[in-house]
Interface confidence: low
């Protein structure tokens, strides 16, 4: 059972906006009341819902881990987007942690791609141009990051 399938019950603050459900569902940015008669807005910066839903609560906003930067803050309809900080990247195989980018290419190889928040540096052989992705001893420190599509939010 995922975190989202076991839905907590959150009590609505008095100032939260309310409307009526449509066909038993509430719009993004809202959750349903316990008697299913009202849609209650999520609390900005605290929780959110991205789809039409019948949740008894809004999903809690992700807090970025240390080693991550907040690219987009949480709104009532979108979770926080976290990105690895400069000099680190998130691998597809282990998306839960930011790994340090290699600081340079081994001898006989040249860097063709800088470190980004979602990929390590890329090295190719000077002559053949074939890629090399293994861990290597550092020979030069060239670490740059460029903004781009952030990794999927961690929750």
């Amino acid at each position: 059972i995922t975190r989202q399938s076991l839905d907590p019950q959150r009590r609505a603050a008095p100032q939260q906006k309310r409307s009526s459900p449509t066909e038993g569902l509430c719009p993004p940015g809202h959750h349903i009341s316990e008697d299913s008669r009202e849609c209650i807005s999520c609390k900005y910066g605290q929780d959110y819902s991205t789809h039409w839903n019948d949740f008894l609560f809004c999903l809690r906003c992700t807090k970025c881990d240390s080693g991550e930067v907040e690219v987009n803050s949480c709104t009532t309809t979108r979770n926080t987007v976290c990105q690895c900080e400069e000099g680190t990247f998130r691998e597809e195989d282990s998306p839960e942690i930011c790994r340090k980018c290699r600081t340079g290419c081994p001898r006989g190889m040249v860097k063709v791609k800088d470190c980004t928040p979602w990929s390590d540096i890329e090295c190719v052989h000077k002559e053949s141009g074939t890629k090399h992705t293994g861990e290597v001893p550092a020979v030069e420190k060239t670490v740059t990051t460029s903004p781009g599509t952030p990794a999927s939010p961690c929750s």
């Epitope: 975190r3 399938s5 076991l6 839905d7 019950q9 038993g24 299913s36 609560f57």
Partner: antibody, heavy 121, light 118 residues
């Protein structure tokens, strides 16, 4: 007095079908969500399916999705569970339960006595 | 690992107080959940005992005496059912549950068998 009475259980072969019914009385049936919960012999409780007060929204446990259908007839104060493609692991006592959804509790506050479904060749 | 963990069995003497535990898996936060408790005596259907969200937001099941009470330990991610003045008829299986979707109401724990020693 709230009463829920299940019927329709019995012995069925694997792959077969069965339709369970639950007759409700003692409360305004059309204003409450209803559920089916099962209990395999000597085991714990497993929520099976739920339906909202009007019958518009239906929900199923992953283990029965695509095989079981929950429905209700508010004019007859009745809840149903159509069970198709039955498997040995569906063998259990099936309880009909009321969702206290007109209050803030949202608990399964009243239960029937249960009906036994046995799937065996 | 189940979402809700309950010890399989507990026992206590007649007239004493016992506290049954329901531990929520640590990728969930019990602070934002209501905890439900059900009692099932042998050969009987389950009976709703109580719901506990907080001291100011809780409810007792129909005809359930106040010697059954709920509580939570948010730091330990646990819900509790306390039964005071244990009686022979309290010998039963006790299931905790957590609210799920607005209609898909419950995820049940595996249950704790309570034995009342005379």
């Amino acid at each position: 007095e709230v009463q829920l009475v299940e019927s329709g259980g019995g012995l069925v072969k694997p792959g077969g079908s069965l339709r369970l019914s639950c007759a409700a009385s003692g409360f305004t049936f059309s204003t409450y969500g209803m559920h089916w919960v099962r209990q395999a012999p000597g085991k714990g409780l497993e929520w099976v399916a739920g339906i909202n007060y009007s019958g518009n929204n239906k929900y199923y446990a992953d283990s029965v999705k695509g095989r079981f259908t929950i429905s209700r007839d508010n004019a007859k104060n009745s809840l149903y569970l159509q069970m198709n493609s039955l498997r040995a692991e569906d063998t259990a006592v099936y309880y009909c339960a009321r969702d206290s959804s007109t209050t803030r509790t949202r608990a399964l506050d009243y239960w029937g006595q249960g009906t036994l479904v046995t799937v065996s060749s | 690992q189940p979402v809700l963990h309950q010890p399989p069995a507990m026992s206590s003497a007649l007239g004493t107080t016992i506290r049954l535990t329901c531990t929520l898996r640590n990728d969930h936060d019990i602070g934002v959940y209501s905890v439900y408790w059900y009692q099932q005596r042998p050969g009987h259907p389950p009976r709703f005992l109580l719901r506990y969200f907080s001291q100011s937001d809780k409810s007792q099941g129909p005809q359930v005496p106040p010697r059954f009470s709920g509580s939570k330990d948010v730091a330990r991610n646990r819900g509790y059912l306390s039964i005071s003045e244990l009686q022979p008829e309290d010998e039963a299986m006790y299931y905790c549950a957590m609210g799920a979707r607005s209609s898909v109401t419950h995820v049940f724990g595996s249950g704790t068998q309570l034995t009342v020693l005379s």
